[in-house]
Interface confidence: low
């Protein structure tokens, strides 16, 4: 598999058949698949060197692994997008052997002297062809030469099979399956041959290809493959339940932010709630996690403005649940990214010198910002797309707080909507879905560069649109939701999470 280890060394060779039998639309589809693969790999913070070859009668090398920019995913993608099916129009045979020889030439070293560290570099060849090679001889001989060059399969004690993976995608109207199977790597419990049909569900393909065991602690990563559970898609999501004898129970959501902490809303708890009455589950697991302590933001006080006629005041409505035992990260349990951390800088592929302010400008610019929250409907977690009104619609969004029960007498809306809040909901630019009571404490998320970054904590809503746990279809335009802006509570987060190795900026 493609081992995505941020500290490892890897070369990926993209080889694309542009011969007559492929057809323009299949060529374009194959290109799109490779673009998506480059993006998927880059989302792990891994920077392999890429080689890029197209071929028909002759190969054409577009990017050499030795080039300075070959590890710049955006640049390689740009080169790939500029390739045209017509580039091989005049000589349109299928010489797969020559194409693989071009890959061999990129792998080999001048004067046959292996460079330092050559044996620690993993090589991945991704060949997209219909297998209908009709000139140049059998390409399998070049695969044998490559194995020889990389010293693979020679030493029984150290066969080094991990250092070469050949993936073959069958593209085009007709595919010679025998030829394709012959070229691909054969490894136990791994799939190295994919069909055109598979390319329609690329996330499934990447799931078969990628070994992410070295990067499970990366924040904001998800798997969207079809066989994945809700928690592959939202691995940070935590379900919180507070049992109150004789009073029933309160349900909330939260987000895993580190191996020991879940971030949620303070209003999910009362000061009387004992740790043993708080149930937290993650990863869709049945068992509840043991809780050490719930840490409230010191400025949170729901009764803080009762005297002023404001029955409930949600400013600083955030809390951290500290777990007794360390979470074991896996594909269904991993943290979400927090603002102003090194992890988020890497997730957004920003320079290491990026400041907190620059992250804020990236994630919360002064405009309508596409975001999402996760809600449970009929026992299934679903993503709901909303827009944070952070530009010209911000004022009207906040003013609609006056329609919330108990806030009708508030003279100045800033009494209840403090600078700590982000506002979503309403019908412009689109009709946003609203949060339900059980969504409280869950993350408000911005999805960028294939990663998920939490920018807010769901706090309160103007209208209860979820009578009997069913989200109503028709809701008034003033149905707004308010979320604690994490950029506004960073000092507290930084202090409480200081031992969690999140690298706050």
């Amino acid at each position: 598999k493609i081992v995505l280890d941020p500290s490892g060394s890897m070369n990926i060779y993209l080889v694309l058949d542009g011969s007559d039998s492929i057809g323009a639309s299949n060529f374009t589809g194959a290109k799109k698949c490779l673009v998506n693969l480059i993006e998927k790999v880059a989302s792990y913070g891994v920077k392999p060197r890429y080689g890029l070859v197209t071929y028909a009668t002759y190969p054409k090398i577009w990017v050499k692994v030795s080039e300075a920019d070959s590890s710049n995913a955006d640049w390689v993608t740009k080169q790939l997008n500029e390739i045209n099916y017509e580039d091989h129009k005049l000589k349109s045979g299928t010489n797969t052997k020559k194409a693989l020889q071009a890959v061999y030439s990129m792998m080999s070293w001048p004067d046959d002297v292996p460079p330092e560290g050559w044996n620690r570099t993993r090589h991945v060849i991704i060949l997209m062809t219909d297998g209908l090679h009709n000139m140049g001889g059998d390409p399998i001989t070049v695969i044998d030469e490559i194995r020889d060059l990389l010293y693979i399969g020679k030493d029984r004690k150290n066969p080094r099979e991990d250092y070469l993976d050949v993936y073959v995608f069958g593209v085009g109207p007709l595919v010679n399956q025998v030829n394709i199977n012959a070229l691909a790597s054969k490894k136990d419990n791994e799939q190295h041959v994919f069909k055109v049909k598979d390319m329609e569900n690329l996330e499934d393909v990447f799931y078969q290809m990628i070994d992410e065991s070295q990067s499970l602690s990366l924040c904001g990563m998800v798997w969207e493959h079809r066989k994945g559970t809700d928690y592959h898609k939202q691995p940070w999501q935590a379900k919180i339940s507070v049992i109150r004898p004789s009073k029933g129970h309160e349900s909330c959501m939260g987000a895993v932010v580190s191996e020991y902490f879940v971030l949620t809303a303070a209003h999910c708890f009362t000061v009387d709630d004992k740790e043993h009455s708080i149930k937290v589950s993650v990863g869709g697991e049945k068992r509840d996690l043991e809780i050490e302590v719930v840490l409230f933001h010191p400025n949170y006080n729901i009764n803080g403005k009762k005297e002023a006629g404001i029955p409930e005041f949600y400013d600083y409505d955030v809390a951290l649940i500290k777990l007794k035992n360390k979470l074991k990260y896996g594909q269904t349990i991993r943290p979400i990214c927090l603002p102003c951390t090194e992890g988020t800088t890497r997730a957004l592929r920003l320079p290491p010198t990026t400041t907190c302010q620059q992250q804020k400008e990236e994630l919360l610019p002064a405009q309508d910002i596409k975001a999402l929250f996760v809600s449970e409907e009929e026992k299934k977690l679903t993503r709901k797309e909303v827009y944070i009104k952070n530009g010209d619609k911000k004022g009207s969004c906040e003013r609609d707080a006056q329609y919330a029960p108990g806030y009708d007498k508030v003279k100045d809306i800033s009494e209840v909507v403090t600078p700590r809040f982000l506002c979503t909901g309403g019908v412009s630019p689109y009709a946003d879905p609203n949060t339900c009571r059980g969504d409280s404490g869950g993350p408000l998320i911005v999805h960028k560069r294939s990663r998920f970054i939490q920018v807010g904590v769901i706090s309160w809503g103007v209208v209860d649109v979820c009578k009997n746990q069913k989200r109503q279809k028709q809701v008034p335009a003033h149905a707004r939701d308010f979320h604690i802006n994490l950029f506004q509570v960073l000092p507290w987060l930084k202090e409480k999470l200081q031992d969690e190795d999140l690298g706050f900026l």
Epitope: D20, G23, P173, K197, E200
Partner: antibody
């Protein structure tokens, strides 16, 4: 605007031959695979042949294999279907269509095989 | 060969109705399914390809869904000009095949 115009249809006796043509315009013809699809009177659609964009590869269903030949002349923006050993069941309206799936179709040319 | 079975063969509906036509493939075709509309005396017109992608210029009342073996074409609110015959088509593998057609007529 993509345009496909078929011609060459007509009445032919069983066992006879006919050559259909399709003139293409409004797009880069050499970039696209092309197909022939037929429709018998009052019936559904049946795929007849496909040719790759540069003409090196051709595909047929068993019902016409060995009797029909699809070809193209990219310099002339033209697609052809040479039909021989015609049978009464080949009677249909023959459409030429672009790419796969077929995104643009001509108006069709009628072929009648009858004695 | 992959058989494409459409149902129903005939469908009577009124303007404004929501109608659904289904198509079942005899084996897995991924999402390589297209839908065509054909009116008498005219060639077929591509509506949907790759199961759910609307072709250029096709009104958004037409939508497609499905993958594997079961596919659906939905017209959310029938207009007078939508009465026609509809065909599904698999473009996954040779031989390319079509459904037998669904005739949508005025009730």
């Amino acid at each position: 605007e993509v345009q496909l115009v078929e011609s060459g249809g007509g009445l032919v006796k069983p066992g006879g031959s006919l050559r259909l043509s399709c003139a293409a315009s409004g797009f880069t013809f050499s970039n696209y695979a092309m197909s022939w699809v037929r429709q018998a009177p009052g019936k559904g659609l049946e795929w007849v042949a496909t040719i790759s964009n540069r003409g090196s590869y051709t595909y047929y269903p068993d019902s016409v294999k060995g009797r029909f030949t699809i070809s193209r002349d990219n310099a002339k923006n033209s697609l052809y279907l040479q039909m021989s050993s015609l049978r009464s069941e080949d009677t249909a309206l023959y459409y030429c269509a672009r790419e796969r799936p077929m995104d643009y179709w001509g108006q069709g040319t009628s072929v009648t095989v009858s004695s | 060969d992959i058989q494409m079975t459409q149902s129903p063969s005939t469908l009577s509906a009124s303007v404004g109705d929501r109608v659904t036509i289904t198509c079942r493939a005899s084996q897995d075709v991924g999402t390589a399914v297209a839908w065509y509309q054909q009116k008498p005396g005219q060639p077929p017109k591509l509506l949907i390809y790759w199961a759910s992608t609307r072709h250029t210029g096709v009104p958004d009342r037409f939508s497609g869904s499905g993958s594997g073996t079961d596919f659906t074409l939905t017209i959310s609110s029938l207009q007078a000009e939508d009465f026609a015959t509809y065909y599904c088509h698999q473009h996954s593998s040779n031989p390319l095949t079509f459904g037998q057609g669904t005739k949508l007529e005025i009730k």
